[in-house]
């Protein structure tokens, strides 16, 4: 808390310019009018105020607007946004896209920090939804934004949304995340053909349930491992030898190398072992010739 | 991101140094950048600055003396002194943008005039 005392004889600012940088905490306090800060706030950025001369600038704008500040401040913040603590930022009605994109342009190339996420909540929440221009700004500057959103939180994300996302964003999702996001891609997607349609539903596939995995087994998809390896257990294991073989193409070499780690592991299991040795890749573990398989999940659900 | 200062060192009164700050990434090409200077005892105290549109501004005791300066091509940040006076013996450091505003710094570079 900075103690009231008179400003100096002719020190009182007139406006926010460069000079201010010589102003010790106390002359900042007593000779800057926070109206005239208010107006101004679009050059405090430009100025190089240090850490002790912005919250003096902070106290002055606190005092102004105890209830929040308005649109027209928030905009112009710069750097005095570091400032702000998350019950501030509570305070405030942000509605403009452009304010969002002036406030992340402060933080850009650090974490997220408890401001810019609740900057964003009060964002979103404000709108309503998750919109296409939102959806691409907050990737463009925290491309793990979208992963970091519970699949509750993810349901208000509408599907002309997705056409926002691009691969590296859905990179730390969870197959949680993904069974919401899924749904959505596809419905984004769907007046795609064959191979565009593969190349961006690709990266959602985790969500697919099985019966979309057969339906692109047909059509010479030619999914690489990495995929596949990120694709729903429940959803590979009912797959047959052909169908996983066309679903791959020229990539099923590649199951030798993975055949102790999830999916394939689980899905070898699943196969008899005649169909496996057709693939010619020496998959060991499936259910020897001769045994016959009990589907127990069936009988569980039909009692 | 870091912020390096050189090339200081011992000098004469009525000598000259010329002083250099550089930062990592392209911090100082967008942002206003200052030099402030720490005498033993004493407070950090802003010597130059130059606004993020490249008007610049000077404490009284070292116009006309000191200028500052800036290659954005290089990310570095320059003061000329001239003139020097055994007052302006100092840890002289250089400071913008989000370092600044959260109360980063380098090490500084250390200034005698003896």
């Known amino acids: 808390e900075v103690e009231k005392t008179a400003c100096p004889s002719g020190k009182k600012a007139r406006e926010i310019d460069e000079s201010l940088i010589f102003y010790k905490k106390w002359e900042l306090e007593a000779c800057v009018d926070a109206a005239l800060l208010a107006t101004q706030m679009d050059r405090v950025n430009a100025i190089p105020f240090t850490y002790e001369q912005l919250d003096v600038l902070k106290h002055k704008l606190d005092e102004l607007y105890p209830q929040g500040y308005p649109e027209s401040v928030i905009q112009h913040l710069g750097y005095l946004f570091l400032k702000m603590s998350p019950e501030d930022i509570r305070k405030w009605n942000v509605t403009s896209l452009e304010t969002l994109k002036a406030l992340l342009e402060v933080n850009k190339g650090h974490e997220m920090s408890p401001q810019v996420a609740t900057l964003i909540d009060r964002f979103v929440k404000g709108r309503g939804q998750l919109d296409k221009d939102t959806l691409d700004t907050l990737t463009a500057f925290y491309p793990g934004y979208l992963c970091s959103l519970s699949p509750e939180e993810l349901s208000s994300v509408p599907p002309s949304s997705i056409w926002a996302v691009r691969p590296q964003d859905l990179d730390t999702c969870d197959p949680r995340q993904l069974d919401v996001l899924y749904p959505k891609a596809r419905l984004a997607f769907q007046n795609m053909n064959g191979s565009e349609y593969f190349v961006k539903i690709q990266s959602f596939l985790g969500g697919a349930p099985t019966e979309d995995l057969k339906a692109l087994s047909q059509q010479n998809v030619s999914m690489d491992l990495a995929t596949f390896m990120k694709l729903r257990t429940d959803a590979v294991l009912p797959l047959t030898v052909a169908e996983v073989q066309k679903l791959l193409g020229p990539h099923v070499e590649g199951l030798k190398a993975e055949e102790r780690h999830r999916p394939v592991r689980d899905w070898i299991l699943r196969q008899r072992q005649d169909d496996l040795d057709t693939l010619g890749l020496g998959l060991q573990g499936g259910i020897p010739n001769g045994y016959l398989v009990l589907d127990l999940s069936m009988q569980e659900a039909l009692s | 991101v870091q912020l390096v200062e050189s090339g200081g060192g011992l000098v004469q009164p009525g000598g000259s140094l010329r002083l250099s700050c550089a930062a990592s990434?392209?911090?100082?090409?967008?942002?206003?950048v200052a030099w402030y200077r720490q005498a033993p005892g004493e407070q950090r105290e802003p010597v130059a600055a130059?606004?993020?549109?490249?008007?610049?501004i000077y404490a009284d005791s070292v116009k006309g003396r000191f200028t500052i300066s800036r290659d954005n091509a290089k990310n570095t940040v320059y003061l000329q002194m001239n003139s020097l006076k055994p007052e302006d013996t100092a840890v002289y450091y250089c400071?913008?943008?989000?370092?600044?505003?959260?109360?980063?710094w380098g090490q500084g570079t250390s200034v005698t005039v003896s």
């Open positions: 400071n913008g943008g989000w370092l600044l505003a959260m109360d980063y």
């Open positions: 130059m606004t993020s549109g490249g008007s610049t």
């Open positions: 990434g392209s911090m100082f090409s967008i942002n206003a």
